[in-house]
């Protein structure tokens, strides 16, 4: 039995520019330690969406459910899509350290944007 | 229903060691992640070690750290603590807690009291 | 490490009456639209309780007379109306960063 799991339900989300994006993600524990990350891409070329406590991300709110028992909402909102915000997107675990390493990665969420 | 039952605790003189236990019915132990809390009249509730559900990763203050070692068998359904080189200042009611999510202490047991005097 | 500081120590209140309690941490304890701190009962000879999680969800079958609230570095136990069986020890509790970290207590009693 996996320890820790990331799930992103949803492998795909449409939005109409102009609109908000939610992206889910929930982890099964806040054990091993560390912070939770959100990416568009894969790789070094990767790119930081949003982060509890480092950086500014002005259009990024988190949206988590905190009634929910069982697992930690870890869920983001982005406003004002438009299409440079297309991609996939990932919401991955890291174990504190120093640096902090990275544990385990959601399969990923496709964000396709509408014309208006 | 969920049951922790600690066990293990005692009288011990300073600089010895104790191992407790505590053994887990009523709910899926290997899907929790368990720690100890320990209580005493003069500091209150105090978070003392915790262990990921799998096993490999454990946590401790620095009070503890290097002394207090942290353990589990999910096949035994069974959390264990060993404690060396007891000090005074060790002196408690340790209760046995799971926490489902690694956040809040879900429940606990009813304690074991350890007695660290010469 | 995060200090929490509960006030009062002690608090006597008539039956039926509201009964408040308050933790303030000495950073935030919130974390993506949570905010770890917790709540805890404790009846002389027993262990704590969970009452609220993640300052101001519900456990299962808590009596909805106990209500949390706050966010960041402030939060509020209510009990309204308090019972007889009220009568015990109240803990706050953060799990937003290591160490864990407990407030030193407030014994309600009845006035």
């Known amino acids: 039995e996996e320890e820790l799991q990331v799930i992103q339900p949803e492998k795909s989300v449409s939005v109409a520019a102009g609109e908000s994006a939610t992206l889910n993600c929930t982890a099964t524990s806040l054990i091993p330690v560390g912070p939770i990350q959100w990416f568009r891409g894969v790789g070094p070329g990767r790119e930081l969406i949003y982060h509890q406590k480092e950086g500014h991300f002005p259009r990024v709110t988190p949206v988590s459910d905190p009634t929910k028992r069982n697992n930690m909402d870890f869920s983001i909102r982005i406003s004002n899509i438009t299409p440079a915000d297309a991609g996939t997107y990932y919401c991955v675990k890291f174990r504190k350290g120093s640096p902090d390493v990275e544990l385990k990665s959601g399969a990923g969420t496709e964000l396709s944007v509408r014309a208006k | 229903e969920v049951q922790l039952v600690e066990s293990g605790g005692g009288l011990v003189k300073p600089g010895g060691s104790l191992r407790l236990s505590c053994a887990a019915s009523?709910?899926?132990?290997?899907?929790?992640?368990m720690s100890w809390v320990r209580q005493t009249p003069g500091k209150g509730l105090e978070w003392v070690a915790t262990?990921?559900?799998?096993?490999?990763?454990?946590y401790y203050p620095d009070s503890v750290k290097g002394r207090f070692t942290l353990s589990r068998d999910n096949a035994k359904n069974s959390l264990y603590l060993q404690m060396n080189s007891l000090r005074a200042e060790d002196t408690a009611v340790y209760y046995c807690?799971?926490?489902?999510?690694?956040?809040?202490?879900?429940?606990w047991g009813q304690g074991t009291t350890v007695t660290v005097s010469s | 490490d995060i200090v929490i500081t509960q006030s009062p120590a002690s608090l006597a209140v008539s039956l039926g009456e509201r009964a408040t309690i308050s933790c303030r941490a000495s950073?935030?304890?919130?974390?993506?639209?949570?905010?770890?701190m917790h709540w805890y009962q404790q009846k002389p000879g027993q262990p704590p309780k969970l009452l609220i999680y993640?300052?101001?969800n519900l456990e299962s079958g808590v009596p909805d007379r106990f209500s949390g609230s706050g966010s960041r570095t402030d939060f509020t136990l209510t009990i309204n109306p308090l019972q007889a069986e009220d009568v015990a020890t109240y803990y706050c509790h953060q799990s937003a960063d290591l160490p864990w970290t407990f407030g030193g207590g407030t014994k309600v009693e009845i006035k």
């Open positions: 807690a799971s926490q489902l999510t690694g956040s809040e202490f879900d429940y």
């Open positions: 262990i990921s559900s799998g096993g490999t990763y454990t």
């Open positions: 993640r300052a101001s």
């Open positions: 950073e935030s304890v919130d974390s993506y639209g949570n905010s770890f």
């Open positions: 009523g709910f899926t132990f290997s899907s929790y992640v």
